[in-house]
């Protein structure tokens, strides 16, 4: 998680301090919306189970030049502990299911205060 | 407006059985974490249940657990506390209340109780 | 599960007095995200809980600035700087960091 703390991260961000930062990112992205996030782009419904943050990860990387939820990736890749590459899907995508990468975004931050909240931060 | 607002008290015997409702307008139950918190005549508040409305990831305080379930509608946007074996201890007033939802921090709103009495 | 416990559990007091309620919990209550989850309640007969402080030491809003807390670890006080008629009530200390999530005894502010 050396990497969630930014690239000028001085050693290891604790978990908690890493998903406090991811959840700050999500709440900065929501607040700072003024047109449809990544235009309107749609994105695949995940599970929001174990495993979500390569899901979440997947789910996302196929949205391309969108600088907003750039910063948003690379925190995500962080949680993931195996390499994510732009047509990946794994079991915990609703594969019937897309919506806007703005409500993706909703429900990723909902789940995530929950789980900061909960203390469940791996 | 926020509002959450219960119903369902009354008096029943002991041994007897009582579904409380917690009706929430103005938000999304689904959006933060609604808890079940009661008070005996003249005593202190005491915290019973809490639920997760989005995922039904519930705890209890473990003298509650087995005799009271809590439980959700999400499109009625409603909470339920349904008590069995009532014992004259359980006699008290029952407040819902939800967390704040930004980082569930705390109890920003209740209701105003229903009370239930447990006698014979 | 872990107690808190209130002290005193009444106290009388006069309008403009300054008045301290103290909280200590049977083991600390600094979660596992690194807050202490502890928060201040007041309650008047026949009402529901109205929250004053919370996170130790964050008022919430609308609450008057002579309300104030403090503490770490396991001891907790709220303090009220300048008591106020609509001041007397019965205040009680709650933990939300550990689950069953606890309640203090309460303290009974009456007029003296």
């Known amino acids: 998680l050396t990497c969630l703390g930014g690239f000028a991260s001085p050693g290891p961000v604790p978990p908690s301090t890493a998903l406090r930062e991811l959840i700050e990112e999500l709440v900065n992205i929501t607040q700072n919306q003024k047109a449809p996030l990544c235009n309107g782009s749609m994105v695949w419904s995940i599970n929001l189970t174990a495993g979500m943050y390569c899901a979440a990860l997947e789910s996302l990387i196929n949205v391309s030049g969108c600088s907003a939820i750039e910063k948003t990736q690379r925190m995500l890749s962080g949680f993931c502990p195996h390499k994510v590459s732009a047509g990946q899907f794994s079991s915990l995508h609703v594969r019937d299911t897309k919506i806007e990468v703005a409500q993706f975004v909703k429900d990723l931050l909902l789940h995530l205060k929950k789980l900061f909240r909960e203390g469940q931060f791996n | 407006e926020v509002q959450l607002v219960e119903s369902g008290g009354g008096l029943v015997q002991p041994g007897g059985s009582l579904r409380l409702s917690c009706a929430a307008s103005?938000?999304?139950?689904?959006?933060?974490?609604i808890h079940w918190v009661r008070q005996a005549p003249g005593k202190g508040l005491e915290w019973v249940a809490r639920i997760d409305p989005a995922n039904d990831n519930i705890k209890y305080d473990p003298k509650f657990q087995g005799r009271f379930t809590i439980s959700r509608d999400n499109a009625k946007n409603s909470l339920y506390l349904q008590m069995n074996s009532l014992r004259a201890e359980d006699t008290a007033v029952y407040y819902c209340?939800?967390?704040?939802?930004?980082?569930?921090?705390?109890?920003?709103?209740w209701g105003q109780g229903t009370l239930v009495t447990v006698s014979s | 599960d872990i107690q808190m416990t209130q002290s005193p559990s009444s106290l009388s007091a006069s309008v403009g007095d300054r008045v301290t309620i103290t909280c200590r919990s049977s083991?600390?209550?600094?979660?596992?995200?690194?807050?202490?989850?502890l928060e201040w309640y007041q309650q008047k007969p026949g009402k529901a809980p109205k929250l004053l402080i919370y996170?130790?030491?964050n008022r919430f809003s609308g609450v008057p600035s002579r309300f104030s807390g403090s503490g770490s670890g396991t001891d907790f006080t709220l303090t009220i700087s300048s008591l106020q008629p609509e001041d007397f009530a019965t205040y009680y200390c709650f933990q939300g960091s550990h689950i069953p999530y606890t309640f203090g005894g309460g303290t009974k502010v009456e007029i003296k």
């Open positions: 103005g938000f999304n139950i689904k959006d933060t974490y």
């Open positions: 209340a939800r967390s704040e939802e930004n980082w569930y921090d705390f109890f920003d709103y």
């Open positions: 996170k130790v030491s």
């Open positions: 083991q600390s209550i600094v979660h596992s995200n690194g807050n202490t989850y």
